[in-house]
Interface confidence: low
């Protein structure tokens, strides 16, 4: 047999709506456009699931949230110019009021500093366990000239506005529900939203190209790719920063800090097909 | 819904040929691959061969050299042609098709027509 | 071609017993494996395919697994209605073989 190996393009499209209602954001509504981060990623896609939000940051002065290293007594334990990797801003060399008893370094930076020291839990976008993931994927062997979807010729609109992926009953259904691509690779949704995590979507095309091409499938399986170690917990979960910036009434710059767990969702396409040659069994 | 459904002579003469028609509804033959399998009496199934979507067939190579299956799509038909037919040629002939999608099996099966050949 | 070589030939089962049925193909046949019932003078059912998916409408008591060459087939909590004769197939390479069968009986 001659054989070849799969090259493949994806697309993907999430949907579902979350709602929230907190004190500090009141009544929202989540679509979209809100939890998928960036728009657009080649094979790959990020969907937030918990988030630390700090409204209205302007540039300041103002108090290092305290720990370990920002917590001081006087402005000695303080150091002007300096901005350790984990500061918020550079030192003032000031040691000033951050509440009624704790006293903590004072920082040039986007003021007030982001608190993350407690991440929300359960998750905030708890709802997203039950979007729904559409992967299109396209593939071509080009040795043998074979290309063929995953949407499949027999798959009709109907079906397709319907269906959700089962490996028992929906096999071939390309809309995926996250909570059970989470579950299926053996996890928790709702506790990988809090701290988020990666997931692999794995497409397997292995295709015997001397059967008809209707016989040539995808195959869907799931695995995280993130697993933690139970006995090495440091630095767990996924997680990024990104700001959205305006002006207020009177022009000055204004931004929201935006810290976005979630889980990047990773399409893993990959496959062999193979032909058979009379060639090179004339040559053996 | 999807039905398939077999006819043709229940007797035929031994040397002689075959002919059976698969009728179809509920689906497209242009979409869907169908199959003929038949089963000998008190015996177990033999897959005989298939026509594919796209037109192409393919055969049971034991049956390969008597063996024809063509369709008309326009009247959502199959049809199977044998030659040389012996005794052991007798059984029931089912006409199947795939479940939901080409390639997981025959989910769909006609109820069989018994060929007996005997002189 | 593949040859399914599928045990035993027959099988006594009491009412709420559990049987296996295996298929053994002669190569490996990439989990393209679907299991059939038939009962007398009936059609035959397909129950699971691609090894272990069960089939719409198909009792969970049926189950099915394997990989490579070996593969089976069980029925939990047998009942009067399993009675009948079971077959596998493989669909991994042309032409499709079925196994000899397996005939189902109570005890």
């Known amino acids: 047999q001659e054989t070849d190996s799969v090259v493949s393009s994806v697309t993907t499209k999430v949907k579902g709506v979350a709602v929230t209602n907190t004190s500090k954001l009141g009544f929202r509504i989540w679509d979209v456009a809100d939890y998928v981060i960036p728009a657009q990623e080649e094979n790959s896609l990020f969907v937030m699931t918990n988030v630390i939000l700090t409204m209205n940051q302007t540039q300041g002065l103002c108090p290092e949230i305290p720990d370990a290293t920002t917590v001081c007594k006087s402005d000695a334990s303080c150091t002007a110019g300096s901005a350790g990797t984990h500061s918020n801003g550079v030192s003032t060399g000031r040691c000033v009021a951050f509440n009624g008893s704790v006293k903590t370094c004072e920082v040039a930076a986007w003021c007030p500093v982001e608190d993350d020291t407690h991440v929300p839990q359960p998750a905030f976008l708890k709802a997203a366990e039950n979007f729904t993931l559409l992967v299109k994927n396209n593939i071509w062997y080009p040795k043998f000239n074979f290309s063929k979807r995953n949407i499949l010729p027999n798959i009709t609109t109907t079906y397709l506005k319907s269906c959700i992926y089962d490996a028992k009953t929906d096999p071939f259904c390309p809309i995926f529900r996250l909570g059970k691509i989470v579950e299926n690779a053996g996890h928790s949704f709702q506790d990988m939203a809090v701290e988020g995590g990666i997931m692999g979507i794995q497409v397997n095309w292995d295709c015997n190209l001397d059967r008809a091409a209707s016989l040539c499938l995808p195959r869907y399986s799931f695995r995280r790719l993130d697993t933690r170690d139970v006995e090495h917990n440091v630095s767990p979960g996924y997680n990024f920063r990104f700001a959205k910036y305006y002006r207020d009434l009177a022009g000055n710059e204004q931004r929201t800090l935006i810290k976005a767990y979630g889980i990047r969702f990773d399409i893993i396409v990959f496959g062999k097909a193979g032909k058979f040659d009379i060639i090179p069994t004339m040559i053996n | 819904q999807v039905q398939l459904k077999e006819s043709g002579p229940g007797l035929v003469q031994p040397s002689q040929t075959l002919s059976l028609t698969c009728t179809v509804s509920?689906?497209?033959?242009?979409?869907?691959?169908v199959h003929w399998v038949r089963q000998p009496p008190g015996k177990g199934l033999e897959w005989m061969g298939g026509?594919?979507?796209?037109?192409?067939?393919d055969y049971n190579s034991a049956l390969k050299s008597r063996l024809s299956i063509s369709r008309d799509t326009s009247k959502s038909q199959v049809f199977l042609k044998m030659n040389s037919l012996q005794t052991e040629d007798t059984a029931i002939y089912f006409c199947?098709?795939?479940?939901?999608?080409?390639?997981?099996?025959?989910?769909?099966w006609g109820q069989g027509t018994l060929v007996t050949v005997s002189s | 071609d593949i040859q399914m070589t599928q045990s035993p030939p027959s099988l006594s089962a009491s009412l709420g017993d559990k049987v296996t049925i295996t298929c053994q193909a002669s190569?490996?046949?990439?989990?393209?494996i679907a299991w059939y019932q038939q009962k007398p003078g009936k059609a035959p059912r397909q129950l699971i395919r691609?090894?272990?998916a069960l089939v719409s409408g198909t009792s969970s008591r049926f189950s099915g697994s394997g990989s490579g060459r070996d593969y089976s087939f069980s029925i939990s909590n047998v009942e009067s209605e399993d009675i009948a004769s079971y077959y596998c197939?493989?669909?991994?390479?042309?032409?499709?073989?079925f196994g000899a069968g397996t005939k189902l009986e109570l005890k």
């Open positions: 199947t098709r795939s479940l939901d999608y080409s390639g997981d099996g025959f989910g769909y």
């Open positions: 509920g689906f497209s033959l242009t979409r869907y691959d």
């Open positions: 026509i594919w979507g796209d037109g192409s067939t």
């Open positions: 190569q490996n046949i990439n989990k393209y």
């Open positions: 691609y090894t272990s």
């Open positions: 197939l493989q669909y991994d390479n042309l032409p499709y073989t």
